[in-house]
């Protein structure tokens, strides 16, 4: 809002600055297309380029795509920020055997300590489990007695970590998701006791559910493994991630093992009706960038009329029909009224069907 500026003389005559009453000082006005990196920029270096969603400004001042964590064995560690990439790491119960820039090319399941061995250091996203020989009694290294129990007879000790990415995958190549699942199924068969119950080959009771992974004794990391493009919801069900395949949508966050993909309207559009994790109806943003100044009155709360530039004069504006009517093909819920000196209706076309599920924020 235009502020009361008791000290505006300090910025007077300098169009490159404005007065910020919150911090009570003159601030540098970032040029068009650049955005401040702090509340009250002081110099041009306090302004930066604005990248598209899912891009960040790298050290060379280039907009660079953030890595995605959409592979089933990865989770997001830090989000995509304006000046840093998203960082992915192996999901709980796994560690990274081949690292990649801001991510991991190959994740393996943590090893299970074989008979006669106990966990010295639990596995992390970066390191495999470290085992040590079991001493008589309970070792202090055991978080609980369960962690120190020897595997039941008949169990095949897991001497090597189990890969879930194809061995051919590299830092620059994302493994094929189908192949990943096959590798997981194979690993699941290999590391499960021959006479133990197995879900491999059985119909899944849950859509999108693939076989559960072997559970290291005493580990809390046993959970369902959902199919690609499904996630494990809060109720423990495999649920389909929303799709952003509509023309007017772009992916905001990827489908992860424990959260849905989220979609948003593409740049230049605004969400008129939301849907869970997405937008049911996107419309072109109806207000053009203002080129004119408000009439002298102080934007009174009643019946004030405003000068506005003619619609269609901005590159990202939809021209309004001369008669002010929306085209016959435009449904009533797809138009917004522009109220300037002459009220006109601005048609808002959309490629989206209006009757989409919209059951939450």
């Amino acid at each position: 809002f235009p502020q009361d500026r008791p000290f505006e003389d300090t910025c007077h005559g300098n169009p490159s600055h404005y007065y910020d009453k919150a911090v009570r000082r003159c601030c540098y006005r970032c040029p068009m297309g650049l955005f401040p990196t702090q509340q009250c920029p002081q110099r041009p270096t306090d302004c930066r380029k604005q990248c598209e969603p899912d891009y960040y400004l790298d050290e060379a001042d280039r907009c660079t795509a953030c890595v995605t964590c959409s592979r089933d064995d990865l989770v997001e560690k830090t989000p995509c920020a304006w000046n840093s990439s998203r960082v992915c790491e192996c999901r709980p119960g796994m560690f990274c055997s081949t690292s990649a820039v801001n991510s991991c090319a190959r994740c393996f399941f943590h090893s299970v300590c074989p008979a006669g061995m106990i966990v010295k250091f639990p596995g992390t996203a970066q390191k495999n489990t470290v085992c040590e020989p079991a001493s008589p009694g309970v070792s202090p290294a055991c978080a609980s007695p369960e962690n120190c129990k020897e595997p039941s007879s008949g169990t095949i000790p897991q001497a090597k970590p189990t890969p879930v990415s194809p061995a051919t995958s590299s830092a620059s190549t994302m493994p094929v998701r189908g192949g990943t699942r096959l590798a997981q199924e194979a690993a699941s068969k290999l590391t499960r006791a021959p006479d133990s119950p197995s879900s491999v080959g059985r119909p899944s009771s849950d859509p999108g559910l693939s076989p559960t992974q072997p559970c290291p004794e005493g580990s809390g990391d046993c959970r369902k493994q959902c199919e690609p493009d499904y996630y494990l919801d809060e109720a423990g069900r495999c649920t389909a991630c929303v799709s952003c395949s509509r023309d007017d949508l772009v992916e905001k966050t990827p489908c992860a093992w424990n959260s849905s993909r989220t979609c948003e309207c593409r740049p230049g559009m605004i969400c008129a009706t939301s849907a869970t994790n997405s937008c049911a109806r996107c419309v072109p943003y109806p207000i053009c960038a203002a080129e004119t100044v408000t009439k002298p009155q102080d934007m009174a709360e009643k019946d004030t009329t405003f000068e506005a530039p003619p619609l269609g004069t901005q590159p990202d504006c939809n021209p309004t029909p001369e008669n002010g009517e929306a085209p016959a093909s435009t449904s009533p819920t797809q138009s917004l009224l522009v109220d300037s000196q002459a009220s006109k209706t601005l048609p808002i076309p959309t490629s989206a069907p209006v009757a989409l599920s919209s059951t939450g924020k």
């Epitope: 404005y18 910020d20 605004i270 996107c282 919209s358």
Partner: nanobody, 122 residues
Framework: EVQLVESGGGLVQPGGSLRLSCAAS????????MAWYRQAPGKGCELVSI???????YYTDSVKGRFTISRDNSKNTVYLQMNSLRAEDTAVYYC????????????????WGQGTTVTVSS
Amino acid sequence: EVQLVESGGGLVQPGGSLRLSCAASGFTDDGPDMAWYRQAPGKGCELVSIISADGRTYYTDSVKGRFTISRDNSKNTVYLQMNSLRAEDTAVYYCAPDPRRNCRGGDCCGNWGQGTTVTVSS
């Protein structure tokens, strides 16, 4: 940090009026476009109206002729005057700053303020 506080909601009979206010803080220099959104029970977040920084206003068809959005820059406040209220206007109303940038996803309800509840019932 931008903070918004919505107020003015309440219980009103069909045909009645209410005036919602959205008090803003944390903006520097000229404020951005502002939008009112609403969320009815069990429904999605729906765009109601937008006011530009220079006072141009936009309304969805379901409220045009009944609702009026305005802003008082000296008070850093945006208003939504709601007349001829209908049962279908029952919702929690939220204001959102800079909808061009902030409201591309379906999450413009409740991100900045707690909202104010409007109930239209006889």
